[in-house]
């Protein structure tokens, strides 16, 4: 079964090595999740040809997936640590419902999908400890999430494949942007 960073023998600190700092732990955690997304994308891409499609061809969808923008303060230009951290946490909280949707979408990578979901929850906790301005973080309404989940699960097979692909790609991009920003903090 997939393990969280720190649980496998390779990640256990050697007797004389320094324990991971909070930033290093977060960095390692994001890289672990990205590896998981890569594995899930492989299964998705083997099932359909959507991975070859350009972004424009897939842009017309009703999903409101979190996305980094200049105003969020996470880019090199206009970088703002506090604003960016709030965006990362808020975005991850918004992705949670989509990660729940992914849970029944994989056959051979079912455990990997669960590991991505669980380690994202842990990542949110790590980041919340790091954030100063927790009041600015908005948590999605459970009822809104429940109805969105129902709606996504009611789609036809082709749309569900498309949704799966878009969620994985958007989540990957969001995490990569987050990692770049966190490495500047």
């Amino acid at each position: 079964a997939p393990v969280l960073p720190g649980e496998d023998s390779k990640d256990v600190a050697a007797p004389h090595s320094q324990p991971l700092t909070s930033s290093e732990r977060i960095d390692k955690h994001i890289r672990y999740i990205l590896d998981g997304i890569s594995a899930l994308r492989k299964e998705t891409c083997n099932r359909s040809n959507m991975c070859e499609s350009s972004k424009e061809a897939l842009a017309e969808n009703n999903l409101n997936l979190p996305k980094m923008a200049e105003k969020d303060g996470c880019f090199q230009s206009g970088f703002n640590e506090d604003t960016c951290l709030v965006k990362i946490i808020t975005g991850l909280l918004e992705f949670e419902v989509y990660l729940e949707y992914l849970q029944n979408r994989f056959e051979s990578s079912e455990e990997q999908a669960r590991a991505v979901q669980m380690s994202t929850k842990v990542l949110i906790q790590f980041l919340q400890k790091k954030a100063k301005n927790l009041d600015a973080i908005t948590t999605p309404e459970p009822t809104t999430n429940a109805s969105l989940l129902t709606k996504l699960q009611a789609q036809n097979q082709w749309l569900q494949d498309m949704t799966t692909h878009l969620i994985l790609r958007s989540f990957k991009e969001f995490l990569q942007s987050s990692l770049r920003a966190l490495r500047q903090m």
Partner: antibody, heavy 120, light 110 residues
């Protein structure tokens, strides 16, 4: 065939501007990170800047405020707008693609380069 | 800002020699380092990424090792086609840096 082709290089006066193009064929540019790297005559490689999938950009300190990377997905082309050019910007400019499947930047497909000469 | 220091800047070697080039980062970059080969008048070619993973089509005589701040590119038995300039490149962070590449190592015929 999967390839990148740069164009737009030439002779420009100090203080002038130039726009380089990088045309992609055989793949959709919007799915990848693309970077610009330059090489002054007889010198080593110097990273200039990168554009990520989300149109996020990052630049080397020498390029900040003077150079801008953008793309036109409908033309499958990347651009490097260079302003306030100096003699030390004289170099062969390469565009290169990163497959963006991971978090670290690595460039596995390169164009042939275009020469920019800044001189009066 | 992360800086990459490569050494030596040049070396002379014979066909069949074992060649080692080192690259040092000014701070830890995990294993997020690539190696490139460049021949005169040509674009660079990716040899190794993630410090030790061979890029597609690269001969197995090339190998990479290291993690954190210290990295090595080794050519186990130098071939005529290997005389070129080699560059390391950090892919850890491309923000607020002067250059992502090391200064290069020119491998010449002895």
């Amino acid at each position: 065939e999967v390839q990148l082709v740069e164009s737009g290089g030439g002779l420009v006066q100090p203080g002038g501007s130039l726009r380089l193009s990088c045309a992609a064929s055989g793949f959709s540019l919007s799915n990848y990170y693309v970077t610009w790297v330059r090489q002054a005559p007889g010198k080593g490689l110097e990273w200039v800047g990168i554009i990520y999938g989300s149109d996020e950009t990052a630049y080397a300190t020498s390029a900040i405020g003077r150079f801008t990377i953008s793309r036109d997905n409908s033309k499958n082309t990347l651009y490097l707008q260079m302003n306030s050019l100096r003699a030390e910007d004289t170099a062969v400019y390469y565009c290169a693609r990163d497959d963006s499947s991971d978090w670290d930047a690595k460039f596995n497909l390169w164009g042939q380069g275009t020469l920019v000469t800044v001189s009066s | 800002a992360i800086q990459m220091t490569q050494s030596p800047s040049s070396l002379s070697a014979s066909v069949g020699d074992r060649v080692t080039i080192t690259c040092q980062a000014s701070q830890s970059i995990n294993n997020e380092l690539s190696w490139y080969q460049q021949k005169p008048g040509k674009a660079p070619k990716l040899l190794i990424y993630r410090a030790s993973t061979l890029a597609s089509g690269v001969p197995s005589r090339f190998s990479g090792s290291g993690s954190g701040t210290d990295f090595t590119l080794t050519i186990s038995s130098l071939q005529p086609d290997d005389f070129a300039t080699y560059y390391c490149q950090q892919g850890y962070s491309l923000r607020n840096i002067d250059n992502a590449f090391g200064g290069g190592t020119k491998v010449e015929i002895k």
